[in-house]
């Protein structure tokens, strides 16, 4: 008799999550010297741990803790580069400049993204059929208490001038319900984080509209301000030549606003 | 290049008041806080405090508050400090220094002398 | 607040030799692996010049004869070998919690 299983309203874990999370692990220490010293098995071992026959509903930080203590990580922390809506752009700008780090540049971040996982309450597997989605379901699910454990302690990780992409083309420019205006935001420290610099990517070619001025970015300038942290915001209306002009910033068309 | 220039030195009796000018170039000034920092005559470093130049907000080190006042003025790029009722005590060299939280831009100091 | 204490007050350093200045703070200044500790050097009559920010960064226009180093509570500047313009007045300061506070400064004269 097939013993009945919770159906939930998102996706179930991806396809080969074991093999994918070990690997990626043992990929990204083979390429940052810096964390070569991590055991991959037991980073699986904890990353399992925090979800396996734990109600996927129940799901705390707390259970990250032996993960985020395996894959504990010094990032330049006035090299950090937020995102929103706008992860693709993101990480095509941080392989270009290198001294440059999105969170899915740091060990924890590169074995999550884009994956998603959940277990059973009270058994050891994995389940492959679907998982809780964050709003029809619950919040305090694995993959969202991931991102939000990582995030807030990348946020709170953060010094000097912080700098975070966001997408022009959408309605909220700035989400208060993302990641970035949920949890990073709140979580940059003002004794540390001098200004946080937002760079709004244009979609349009023809689009010469300032998006700096739109609602929800000043909505994002009065958040930053009341907690004492400088806001700056530059549009940028050429994403293509924007990246074109990192790779070759010699470039005499690099010169003229983009 | 980024500069940071203060005025000239004063010379000022007790009980009077000082305002302290730094003007900055090659950078734009409400993208970084300005903080003050003091010198007495060959003693060591003091932090007073630093103002949000995008908001204007001033955070003041326990020592500076009541007398010092840190303000601004974006149309000419320039932070102010003021000091009231002078005390022999506050003859010092003035610093204003960019943020971040270290200190890699310094205006040249501004020498205030309080003697009756 | 965070107390910084500089040791020696003072040294004398002959040229091509090794000047060791350290700062101990009364806790910890490091934050997710950063270490939030800066030096500085002022000559007479100048401002503070920045040397090494964040422990071991070496400021941009500063030689490689100057180097941090420590993290926690113990940090050293080292500069090796010493040049006759190096007579100044250092001071580390640490910017991990409000308020910043500097050492009291250590005297570097050259024999």
């Known amino acids: 008799v097939p013993r009945w299983r919770q159906q939930w309203s998102g996706p179930g874990t991806t396809k080969r999550f074991p093999e994918t999370v070990l690997a990626r692990c043992v990929k990204y220490t083979e390429i940052h010297p810096e964390m070569r010293h991590v055991d991959c098995q037991s980073v699986w071992d904890a990353f399992k741990g925090a979800f396996i026959s734990k109600h996927p509903c129940n799901i705390t930080e707390e259970d990250y803790q032996p993960l985020m203590k395996l894959g504990t990580q010094t990032v330049p922390c006035n090299k950090i580069l937020l995102w929103s809506r706008i992860k693709d752009l993101a990480h095509q700008f941080t392989q270009v400049q290198r001294d440059m780090f999105t969170l899915e540049d740091t060990l924890l971040g590169y074995l999550a993204d884009d994956l998603t996982w959940c277990g059973e309450f009270n058994t050891s597997k994995i389940n492959y059929q679907s998982c809780p989605d964050w709003r029809k379901d619950c919040s305090n699910n694995p993959v969202s208490v991931f991102w939000k454990t990582v995030s807030r302690r990348f946020a709170e990780a953060a010094c000097d001038v912080v700098h975070v992409m966001l997408n022009g083309s959408r309605s909220k420019i700035f989400d208060k319900n993302s990641t970035f205006g949920s949890v990073e935001v709140h979580n940059l420290q003002p004794e540390k984080v001098q200004t946080l610099e937002a760079w709004v990517i244009h979609g349009g070619r023809e689009d010469s509209r300032d998006l700096c001025q739109d609602p929800t970015i000043k909505e994002l300038e009065s958040i930053i301000s009341k907690r004492n942290i400088q806001f700056s915001c530059k549009n940028i209306y050429r994403p293509d030549k924007f990246l074109q002009c990192v790779k070759n910033p010699e470039d005499s068309s690099c010169t003229s606003e983009i | 290049q980024i500069q940071l220039v203060q005025s000239g030195s004063e010379l000022k009796k007790p009980g009077a008041s000082v305002k302290v000018s730094c003007k900055a170039s090659?950078?734009?000034?409400?993208?970084?806080?300005m903080n003050w920092v003091r010198q007495a005559p060959g003693q060591g470093l003091e932090w007073m405090g630093w103002?949000?130049?995008?908001?204007?907000?001033?955070t003041y080190a326990d020592d500076f508050k009541g007398r010092f006042v840190f303000s601004l003025d974006t149309s000419v790029s320039t932070a102010y400090l003021q000091i009231s009722s002078l005390k022999a005590e506050d003859t010092a060299v003035y610093y204003c220094?960019?943020?971040?939280?270290?200190?890699?831009?310094w205006g040249q100091g501004t020498l205030v002398t309080v003697s009756s | 607040d965070i107390v910084l204490t500089q040791s020696p007050a003072s040294l004398a350093v002959s040229p091509g030799q090794r000047a060791t200045i350290t700062c101990r703070t009364s806790e910890s200044v490091d934050s997710y692996g950063n270490s939030f500790m800066h030096w500085y050097q002022q000559k007479p009559g100048q401002p503070p010049k920045l040397l090494i920010y964040?422990?071991?960064n070496l400021e941009s226009g500063v030689p490689a004869r100057f180097s941090g180093s420590g993290s926690r509570t113990d940090f050293t500047l080292t500069i090796n070998p010493v040049e006759a313009n190096d007579t100044a007045n250092y001071y580390c300061q640490q910017s991990n919690e409000d308020p910043w506070t500097f050492g009291q400064g250590t005297k570097v004269e050259i024999k």
């Open positions: 964040r422990a071991s």
């Open positions: 090659g950078y734009a000034l409400t993208n970084y806080g």
């Open positions: 220094a960019r943020y971040p939280g270290w200190f890699a831009y």
């Open positions: 103002i949000n130049t995008y908001t204007g907000e001033p």
